[in-house]
Structure formats: C-alpha cells, structure tokens
Interface confidence: low
C-alpha cells in the first residue's frame, strides 16, 4: 500500500517522467505500477493502445489524435511520437532490417550527443540455441548478430534464474556478493521472505552492491530507468525510449534498458523444443525491429550501441521428471525445501537444535542408483558456482540433474486433472550446462564489425557497459579489460598487479644431521656418496626456470616468505609459513613415460637441506594422525630418471593429503596428466594448495586459517588446484606456443571421503575424471583463492591474457 | 470427476479445539493443494490457510498463526484443519477447497470446494 | 495485506438485465483475480480465473474484465438461476483476501 500517495494529481504532460515523484505527489513514471503509487490518469494519458503501434498506408498524414497510441501525423516527426515504421510506411524509407551490413567506424550522433548512447535489450529465458533459428523467425536479431559482435553463448551466474542474473549483469557481482541469490529467499536476520511476488522485493535492503544505473548517477551520467511494470506493453517501453532519446541534451539519459518477460514465459509452458516457441521469438524480433526502425527514423542507428542479452537458457523438464525427498528422508515437513531445479533446504522451525545438516546430508547421498540430485553443504558446492558466501543461502544445497526437479513431497507437486504437467521447461540449473547458456549480440560503433567472440560470463558485462559509458566501475567480480577485444576501441588499459612478496633463492645448504622427519628415506640411498650428489642438484639451477615456468613466476600478493626451490623436473613456491608449496609448475612432453616407484620410497620422504628445519613438515604429525596421509605436488610418476625421482620425495614437496583425496591425486597424476600431454603435445602444469576455511571464494589469511586448525603444526587445505596449459594448435608443442594458449583448471575439494562420487568404490577409472569435470574453474577462480597472480610472463597481450583466466572449460557439448 | 468430502457439523466448548477433515476423491491426492476458507453466518468468504507447494510448507493467515494446523494424510487423501482455542467467534462454516495449478505455478485459484462443515462454539 | 473492496454490497436487477459488478484492490495484483458465485447455503463457485478467463462449464453471459487494480465481472444478460452473492479474490500474495460480496437480488 502506499497511503502516502495522493493520486488525485494528473500524468498530464508527465508520462514517463524520469524522475521519480516523491511522496506525498502521485507518480508517473514506469515502475509507479509497481509502486501502486501512479496518479489516477496514468493508464489513460500513458497507456494508450488505440489503432496500434504501426503505421499503415490508410493512416499516413492522420489528423493527430491524442487518443492514438503512437502516430502518423506529419508532424509526429518533429513531436518525437511517430509510430516506429512511419517513415517506411508513409515516406518510403527501407526498413532496418532490409538494410546491408554497413560498418560505423565512429559513432555518427546528432550535435549535442556527448557519447553514443547505450540500449541494453535484454530478453528472459532466451536459450543460446535459439539463435539457430535465425533470420527466418528473428531477421532483425539475426541481422544485430551477424553485423554486430556476438559471441555463441554467454554464461549465466547461478542459480540460473531471473532475479539473480538480471542484478548480476546490472551490478557485476556473484550473487553471493549482490545478495539476490535466487528468485526467493530468506534473509534469517531481517526475518523476512524475498518472492518474485510480494512487496518485500521493493525493500532496498536486499539489493547489494552498485548497479550501473547508480554508477552513472554518481559519475553524472544520466541513466533511464531500467525496470518496467509488467503491465506496460513492449511496444510502449520501445516508443518510451525513443522519446527519451529525443530529450534535450541535458534532460536525455546515455543508457537506457529495455525488458523482455519472454521467451521465458513460452519457454515454461512449452518447453524450448516446442514448436509454439517460434510465435515468441518472432514477437521478440518485431520488438527489435521497431526499435531499430525507431532509431533509424531518429537518425541515431549510426549512434548507439546497443547490447541484446539474455538472462538465462531454457531446459525440457517436467513433472513427472521429479525427485521427491520424501523417498529419502523420514522428516520432510520439518525442513523447508525451496524447490524445483535446485535445492536449497533449511529447518522449518528457527532454532531448532535438532536440525543437523550433517545428518540430512547423509540421508541424502547416493541412496538410488538412479538418484537425479546430488547434496552438498555448501561450501563444498564447485567452487566455480560461487554459491556459499552469504547468509541467504541455506546450508545444505541440491544440484539437480539437467531436466529434473525436486520436491519435498508428491503433495508439493500439481498435474492438471487430465495429469498433464502445468510445464514443460524450466531453469536453475548448473550454470555450465549448455541449455542454460543465453545469447549475447553488441552492436553499434563502439562494437566490432562482424566479429565472433568466445563465450563469457555475465559477471564480464558489467565493466563492458561501464567502459561504453566512460565509467569508472564499482569494485565486482568481473575482470575488467578481459573482454577488450569485444570493442573496436578500448579506454581501460588493464595493468599486471604488483607483486607484494619476492621470493628467497636458498642459500643455504642445511646439515643433515639437523633434520628429524621422523620417516627419513636417505639410508636407503646406496652407495652412500651419491647422497651428496643428489643434494649438490638441489643447488643447480640449471634451465629449469625456461623449462618448468613456461609463463613467469606466479607473483604473491600478499605479505609473506617464500623460496623459490628448482629441480630438474619441477619448480616450487615454497612456503616457510604453511610449510608446503604455495605453487608447483612442471612441464610434461608429449612423449613422457610414467615410471613406477620403488618400494623403498613409497613410504618415506627426503630432507630437504635447502629450507631450514624449522620450516620443514614432520612426518610425525601424519604417523600420529591416522585421518591424515600425505601426497606430492610433482608426481614422482613423471620423473624423467631414478636420480630426479629422489627430488619428488622431498619434504618441501610434500603436502597434507586424506587418504580418500589420495585416491583422486594419484589417478590424476598418474594417469590423466600423461593422457591430457599426449592429447594436447605438452602441458604444463602448476599445482597448489588452497585454503578457504571461509568459503569466501578469496584466499584467507594466516590469521583465519589459524582460527579453523588450531592445534595443528600443518594447515590442512580446503581444496588442491590445478592448471593445465597448452598450445592451442596442438600441433605446437607446449613449450615453443607462439600462438594463443588453452588453458583448463581445477579446484578440487580436499575431503575426507569421496562420496560426492556415487561410484567411488570402483575403479579411479571409472568417477575420477567426471569428478574433476564438476569442479572445473577458470584460473582467476584460483587466483582469488590463492591470491596468486599467474601467465606474467607471455608474448601475448595483457588483455588476452585476461581473456585466458576467465575462460571456463565447461566439458560440455556444442551448443 | 474430482470430490471434496468435509466431516460432519461439530458443537464445541469455548477454548476447545476441532478437527475437521476432508476427503479427495476422483485424481491423485498427491497432486492435489488444499486450503480452508470459512465464512462466519451473513458473512464473507475468509481464507486461513493451505498447504502451499511454493512454500515448501502449510501456510497461514496471521490472524490464525499459532491456531490453527493443516495437515494431509496421503495414505486417507483426507486433508485436516484443526482450530485451538475456539471462541463464539469462531462459529462459521468451514470449506476446503483445492488450490489449482497453471503453467507458471501453483495459483490460489480454488476450482474445487467441499460441501462445506459448520462448526459452532458455544457455552 | 491486500485489501478487496467490491461495489455496490448489493443490486436489485430482472432476469435479462446486463449486470455489472466492480471489484478493486488496495495495489497492484496484475491478473491474479478470481470471481466465484455463491447460493445461500452451498460452497462457492469458480466463474472466472486470472481476471478475465471462463472457468469451464460456466455459461458465456458471465465475463470479466480488468487489471491492475480494477476488475469488472458482467452478466451479460441475467437469468433466474444467477440471483447469489458474488465475490472477487486475489491471490497475488499470501494472505490470499476476498471481497465482501456483492449480493444480487430479483428486482
């Protein structure tokens, strides 16, 4: 309710306004719907739909008629309300669309404009593979696309739905960090529910972080209002932003959004395979073509740029496909579960110390061999989801298969008496999956001519839209300048981050005698002179640093003491506070073997006399702690001769390991590094740990980590990473690439279990990989966590490189 | 053809409680939604609450919080409302209706109503 | 809550009269509204779903109109079986709200 409002007061002359009346004045711009708060005429002077939105030849030279909803008068031109094809229809004019390609090398604006402005058009539940339709059904889509720059699909955030992906192309944020984590929430500080509807939505005190519409204000940039009442037809919102768009100079806003609620509403009901999904789509392009043909008549298509975008894909799900926990749990009407194509589940009752997540969790995991959902607390969810970090977010998390939903119960699910389901599409799912992918078009004189791009992440854009209005973003999530190569001309220069902490090169050879690893190899060294040549080698630096950091030393952003530690086969990070590696990089040929290990070094480890001993892990802690083994960071599998394999059982090579985890490292080491060099002529490969005790996605600090393992001599990692680059054109091999890079990584939970793999029980062969898919990550991901900067030394431009970390390789098929 | 069966009429003592029950037939009960509406004599229509899919739970109006439980027994397809702390103003029919469901969800649009049962508290 | 208001409480028409009955809302409720027919002594009965939509089986003379806050349902022409108190309900948000009822009577 809005008693404040007087709505007695008129929208004469005010339709549209952008500024926004405060109370106690009725309103009568476009979300005053919304608000309830409009003055008592705005439907009837602001809404009117009379004789359509077109033209036809009949109407050309009408007398005006203020009832029209837009007009074909011969003054409409000059009064800035000509229905969008009036010149076409009534002046001859081509459409738009009819148009060739043509290249705008420079924004041609009207005087008065200061830059080209923005229109963002974005379309909910526009799945990526609806492009293929091309221009039969979508000419004017089809025709921003191939002139414009687009790229195949663009990655949603998840979950993939509305709310969250509308505020995180609107702010650049995770929503973890905007806060809007899903189309419903709870909030148990405010206490309160977060619907699609409902009013709780209007409360500012759930939106986080700064969209561009605030960024603009701020920076004096006048932006149009970016949200619009359902109840305001397409058609509407299009003449509204063309009458903007004929302000003056200083009432005219540079950015404008325009939005669609389908395809999504189509996609629901038919599904994204359903043959009624071509009516929407053809609607959507009639709406592009007016505002182009719009632009056109104003004479500024040659002007603006203009972003199509979706929010998110459309899967084929239905009712019946649906999981029930009722199957799986005894207590289902005590929890609350929010439903559908992912689930998030909390006590029903606040409170409640008998609710254990732990134990649902265990109740829920790998009970039926068919099973279409897999449980996780969410700080074990992918790393790559960036779904933990926030209150709103309930402990214990759903990932729902593809085409699935779960519900708590049969009685939460509704057929239509015939038992139809009321639906045949929906989306949420993990954001890697290619049915959610949405589409991304630029077009305009900032944009490339012509260009295919490849995919990114919505998370990117936000700093995009920034640059195409000389913005200086808020602080987000994106990668500002990863996407320069979308624009024909770039205003941000990304530069390297300084390296806060240089490494020590160890000087110092320790004694022998000073070391007490209490698991000690070297007396099963024969003879016993060449103990001392395999320490001489520790000192040798040789061509390593060519050979096993083929990009640069990873640079450390933080305050700390580190050595840089060479060996024949590999190169570490060596930490003196964690006592293990921060980073180690090796480099496999195409034709590396994997070798055996001897018995006699299966169970022990090397001193390491470079690193003091008082820096160095004891193998006491593990023979004390039966929960924990360890593993190494360059496998000795890969040692290119016996007297190398001796460096991979250094201490300073070791690291704390579960011995579940071990089962998964050692697959990887052992077998799929070889596959991935033999597939991909050479990798290279650096490896680390992580620690986010957190979950905050960005590395913690000695400090916290001190907090969560108290007690413990040796820090456990949350999680191990991976980077595994390569040439591009396989035909290179990796270390002489003189063309674009290929990088794959992952941030591999380290768990004491493996019972994220329904299989593990079988073979490594059988779940290994498939696991290390789920948890696939973009090297910037790793970076956060390790605070680590990566790829500093490479022929290749900076922004290239930036481009290079915030690519994810999803092991998807094609869109 | 879908049913809604409601229990027969109750009289009942200020500060009891009653428990009214209602029988789906003709449908799966699994698929069905109910809420209670009731309507005191010469009155309008006043919905207390059903048990909601979106929710994830049963759903109440305030003014019935901490009153009233809507509970459903798949195994019966009998759905139950159970009102505590009865006073004279609580004398109403009460009705059962089913909550129908369209293509974007689960809308409270009630397609289907029990014949209803009138509950009448009194000293 | 979202509060219903219905007008007029109730109508004195003959059989064949066109009937109109007003309903609004406290805000906005988009389409979400229902009409339902009630006869003393007997359940209430869905006429008309999402603001504008026939429930099946419910004769053509009956239609409704509106969005947003105002809402129309019309008897195009009455009959003698259409005398019943008529109510408008939103379900835009929990708590669902009905109207108070527009009762019409033979003139």
């Known amino acids: 309710d809005s008693p404040w409002t007087n709505i007695s007061g008129s929208c004469k002359g005010r339709c549209f306004e952008l500024q926004e009346a405060g109370p106690p004045d009725c309103r009568c711009d476009n979300l005053c719907k919304s608000y309830t708060s409009c003055c008592h005429d705005f439907d009837e002077l602001c809404l009117k739909t009379a004789r359509g939105w077109e033209c036809t030849k009949d109407r050309c030279g009408e007398v005006r008629n203020e009832e029209n909803a837009c007009h074909c008068s011969e003054d409409c031109l000059a009064r800035g309300d000509c229905c969008t094809n009036y010149q076409v229809v009534c002046k001859g004019e081509s459409h738009w669309v009819d148009d060739d390609c043509e290249e705008i090398k420079a924004a041609e604006c009207p005087a008065g404009f200061v830059r080209p402005p923005l229109i963002i058009f974005s379309v909910d539940g526009f799945r990526a593979s609806y492009m293929k339709k091309g221009s039969k059904v979508m000419p004017n889509i089809e025709k921003l696309r191939s002139c414009g720059t687009h790229s195949p699909y663009m990655r949603p955030v998840y979950p993939t739905k509305t709310f969250p992906n509308l505020y995180t192309l609107a702010t650049g944020l995770y929503p973890e960090s905007h806060g809007i984590v899903g189309n419903s929430m709870y909030d148990p500080v405010f206490d309160a529910t977060f619907h699609l509807r409902g009013r709780e939505k209007f409360n500012h005190r759930w939106w986080g972080g700064q969209p561009l519409w605030i960024t603009a204000t701020k920076q004096g940039v006048k932006a149009g209002t970016f949200f619009w009442s359902v109840v305001i037809p397409h058609e509407r919102r299009i003449l509204t932003i063309l009458q903007w768009l004929t302000l003056p100079d200083h009432e005219r806003p540079s950015v404008y959004a325009f939005y669609s609620e389908q395809p999504d509403f189509s996609g629901h009901k038919y599904g994204p395979f359903g043959p009624e999904m071509t009516n929407p789509l053809r609607e959507i392009d009639k709406i592009v073509g007016q505002l182009m043909d719009g632009l056109k008549q104003l004479k500024l298509h040659r002007c603006v740029n203009v972003i199509f975008v979706g929010d998110h894909g459309m899967e084929d799900v239905t009712c019946d496909r649906t999981e029930f926990l009722s199957n799986y749990l005894t207590n289902v009407d005590d929890i609350t579960l929010v439903p559908g194509t992912l689930g998030r589940i909390r006590s029903k009752f606040s409170n409640n110390a008998k609710y254990d997540p732990k134990a649902i969790i265990a109740n829920l995991t790998c009970k039926k061999p068919d099973q279409h959902f897999k449980p996780y607390l969410k700080q074990h969810l992918p790393k790559r989801l960036h779904y933990a970090n926030n209150r709103r977010i309930e402990d214990i998390h759903l990932l729902v298969e593809r085409r699935w939903h779960v519900a708590r119960k049969p009685l939460d699910v509704y057929k239509k008496p015939s038992g139809k389901c009321f639906f045949q599409g929906d989306h949420g799912f993990d954001n890697k999956v290619n049915s959610m992918q949405t589409v991304f078009v630029g077009y305009g004189s900032t944009f490339k001519y012509k260009t295919k791009v490849p995919p990114f992440e919505n998370i990117e854009l936000y700093n995009v839209m920034c640059d195409l209005l000389g913005l200086k973003p808020a602080p987000n999530n994106g990668t500002h300048g990863s996407l320069n190569h979308l624009l024909r001309t770039n205003t941000f220069r990304p530069t390297m981050p300084e390296e806060v902490t240089r490494p020590n090169y160890p000087g110092i050879m320790y004694l022998q005698s000073d070391f007490d690893l209490g698991c000690t190899c070297d007396d099963k060294v024969e003879p016993k002179n060449k103990l001392d040549e395999l320490n001489k080698r520790l000192h040798t630096k040789g061509s390593t640093e060519e050979r096993h950091l083929l990009y640069g030393r990873p640079a450390v952003l933080y305050r700390t003491r580190y050595d840089i530690l060479y060996h024949t086969d590999f190169e570490s990070g060596y930490s003196e506070i964690f006592l293990m590696p921060l980073w180690t990089s090796y480099t496999v040929s195409k034709q590396a073997e994997v070798s055996s290990v001897p018995d006699h070094l299966t169970s022990c480890v090397r001193p390491d006399v470079r690193v003091s001993p008082s820096f160095s892990q004891n193998c006491l802690a593990y023979k004390n702690d039966k929960q924990m083994s360890y593993g190494f960071l360059f496998p000795p599998y890969l040692s290119s001769s016996p007297e190398a394999k001796y460096d991979a059982f250094l201490v300073t090579n070791m690291v704390p390991m579960y011995p579940a985890f071990k089962r998964v490292w050692n697959y990887f080491q052992r077998v799929l590094v070889k596959k991935y060099a033999s597939e991909r002529n050479g990798v290279n490969v650096i490896s680390g740990p992580i620690f986010d005790y957190d979950y905050d996605g960005l590395h913690d600090t000695e400090d916290k980590i001190k907090q969560y393992v108290e007690g413990s001599s040796i820090p456990v990692p949350t999680h191990y990473y991976s980077i595994i680059t390569s040439c591009l054109d396989f035909t290179q091999p990796a270390d002489k690439c003189d063309g674009p890079l290929s990088v794959s990584s992952f941030i591999l939970p380290h768990r004491p279990d493996n019972e994220e793999s329904c299989n593990s029980s079988e073979d490594e062969s059988k779940w290994v990989e498939e696991l290390m898919k789920m948890h696939t990550a973009r090297v910037r991901d790793i970076e956060h966590l390790t605070s680590l900067d990566f790829f500093r030394k490479t022929s290749r431009s900076y922004p290239e490189i930036l481009t290079l970390k915030t690519y994810l390789h999803t092991y998807e098929s094609e869109i | 053809q879908v049913q809604l069966v409601q229990s027969g009429a109750e009289v009942k003592k200020p500060g009891s409680s009653v428990k009214v029950s209602c029988k789906a037939s003709g449908g799966t009960f699994s698929s069905y939604a109910i809420s209670w509406v009731r309507q005191a004599p010469g009155q309008g229509l006043e919905w207390m609450g059903g048990?909601?899919?979106?929710?994830?739970?049963?759903n109440y109006a305030q003014k019935f919080q901490g009153r009233v439980t809507i509970t459903a027994d798949e195994s019966t397809s009998t759905a139950y409302m159970e009102l505590s702390s009865l006073r004279s103003e609580d004398t109403a029919v009460y009705y059962c209706?089913?909550?129908?469901?369209?293509?974007?969800?689960?809308?409270?649009?009630?397609?289907?109503w029990g014949q209803g049962t009138l509950v009448t508290v009194s000293s | 809550d979202i509060q219903m208001t219905q007008s007029p409480s109730s109508l004195s028409a003959s059989v064949g009269d066109r009937v109109t009955i007003t309903c609004r809302a406290s805000q906005s409720i988009s389409s979400y509204l229902n009409w339902y027919q009630q006869k003393p002594g007997k359940a209430p009965k869905l006429l008309i779903y999402a603001a504008s939509s026939l429930q099946s089986g419910v004769p053509s003379r009956f239609s409704g109109s509106g969005s947003g806050t105002d809402f129309t349902l019309t008897i195009s022409s009455l009959q003698p079986e259409d005398f019943a108190t008529y109510y408008c309900?939103?379900?835009?948000?929990?708590?669902?709200?009905f109207g108070q009822g527009t009762k019409v009577e033979i003139k």
């Open positions: 209706a089913r909550i129908a469901r369209y293509a974007r969800g689960y809308m409270h649009t009630f397609d289907y």
């Open positions: 048990i909601i899919p979106i929710f994830g739970t049963a």
């Open positions: 309900q939103q379900h835009l948000s929990i708590p669902i709200t």
